[in-house]
Interface confidence: low
Amino acid sequence: EEELQVIQPDKSVSVAAGESAILHCTVTSLIPVGPIQWFRGAGPARELIYNQKEGHFPRVTTVSESTKRENMDFSISISNITPADAGTYYCVKFRKGSPDTEFKSGAGTELSVRAKPSAPVVSGPAARATPQHTVSFTCESHGFSPRDITLKWFKNGNELSDFQTNVDPVGESVSYSIHSTAKVVLTREDVHSQVICEVAHVTLQGDPLRGTANLSETIRVPPTLEVTQQPVRAENQVNVTCQVRKFYPQRLQLTWLENGNVSRTETASTVTENKDGTYNWMSWLLVNVSAHRDDVKLTCQVEHDGQPAVSKSHDLKVSAHPKEQGSNTAAENTGSNERNIY
């Protein structure tokens, strides 16, 4: 009679995490008598997965009725597979005795576990940066298997090319992580921009995972200032405005200086938003020129988002405005932003 063979028909089996794996094993003879055991790995450190004769293996069930006397199918199903279950599984026939002795092993079935990558997490720099500067974004995703993975970076739908990606660990592992760093050059129009990290993996069936970062959290667009003198509103009154344009974020404080002395400080509140996401704001002063003998230097000083102040000045020519006879006192304030100069 032909000697018993242990047949494991599948060289490899691939299963998604959370599913059940069926590992096939049949024997060609009922002789010699003795139990079947399943192991993960070979050699002295192998791990017992199932013993037909005894033991408690809650995740393992037999596919056929292995207790029947004539049964020659010893396939098993392992439930709720995780990446940690990956490895080569051997179906081993033992000869009955005291103790039982190993008789013959199957060739082994390699179980690989497909585990989805976690949602990519994109993080930007800790501090804001201004246009024309290059900033770094990182993208991380974890827990996937197999190791093969593709990562792409986009800015507003345009693929980026300046990035470096690593998959860890380099050697064999039950699951893997990917870490990528992309460099992005900021422009003044980037308040509404998004940086996207896209991860493609065999487990995702062609539907990649994406992580995003809004550049509004990264960019600081410094304001441009313009101080202008408006036409005379009433006799001897000049309206001076400070236009603060194209700034982001909104946090801004403006100080008016008259000949270097602080006149008024205010915080940007009722700003207008531009299409590109930046803001504009305007502050104004009403100056009673009749109260002045000399020219006045008006300075609009702006502190934006905690940065060093920027300023713009305007020289108000008092001599160009005829003074009213006997008018030695300044006119009353006529608005929240009006200012009389003494």
């Epitope: 190791r147 090319s161 990035f163 998959v167």
Partner: nanobody
């Protein structure tokens, strides 16, 4: 250490076909991408074709598009370059290269992206 072993090169006539093979040996190895480069006598090494291990659309040098096909056999752990309608300008030493982790956008045409290289297999196309 990983070694890449190429085979399949040889002397052929114009219009003939060849299939090059590349088999990583050493430790169990999975790359992000595999590529073929070539170097003609007296010229710089140039990109020919690349494919991701995970699959997707391969990338080719313009002059070989439609004639060359890069493919992989994951079960055999082997990569191939099927070269049809060979021309004299296809002559050179063909190198297999492996990019272990992704170094840039898409499939790298830059040899500096590749971590491992084979010794090369010569292909001569005579007219």
């Amino acid at each position: 250490h990983v070694q890449l072993v190429e085979s399949g090169g040889g002397l052929v006539q114009v219009g003939d076909s060849l299939r090059l093979s590349c088999a990583p040996s050493g430790r169990t190895f999975r790359a992000y991408a595999m590529a073929w480069f070539r170097q003609a006598p007296g010229k710089e090494r140039e990109f020919v074709a690349a494919i991701r291990w995970i699959g997707g659309t391969p990338s080719y040098k313009d002059s070989v598009k439609g004639r060359f096909t890069i493919s992989r056999d994951n079960a055999r752990n082997t990569f191939y370059l099927q070269m049809n309608s060979l021309e004299p300008q296809d002559t050179g030493v063909y190198y297999c290269a492996a990019e272990e982790t992704q170094k840039g956008s898409g499939l790298g045409h830059d040899g500096r992206h590749y971590d491992y290289w084979g010794q090369g297999t010569p292909v001569t196309v005579s007219s």
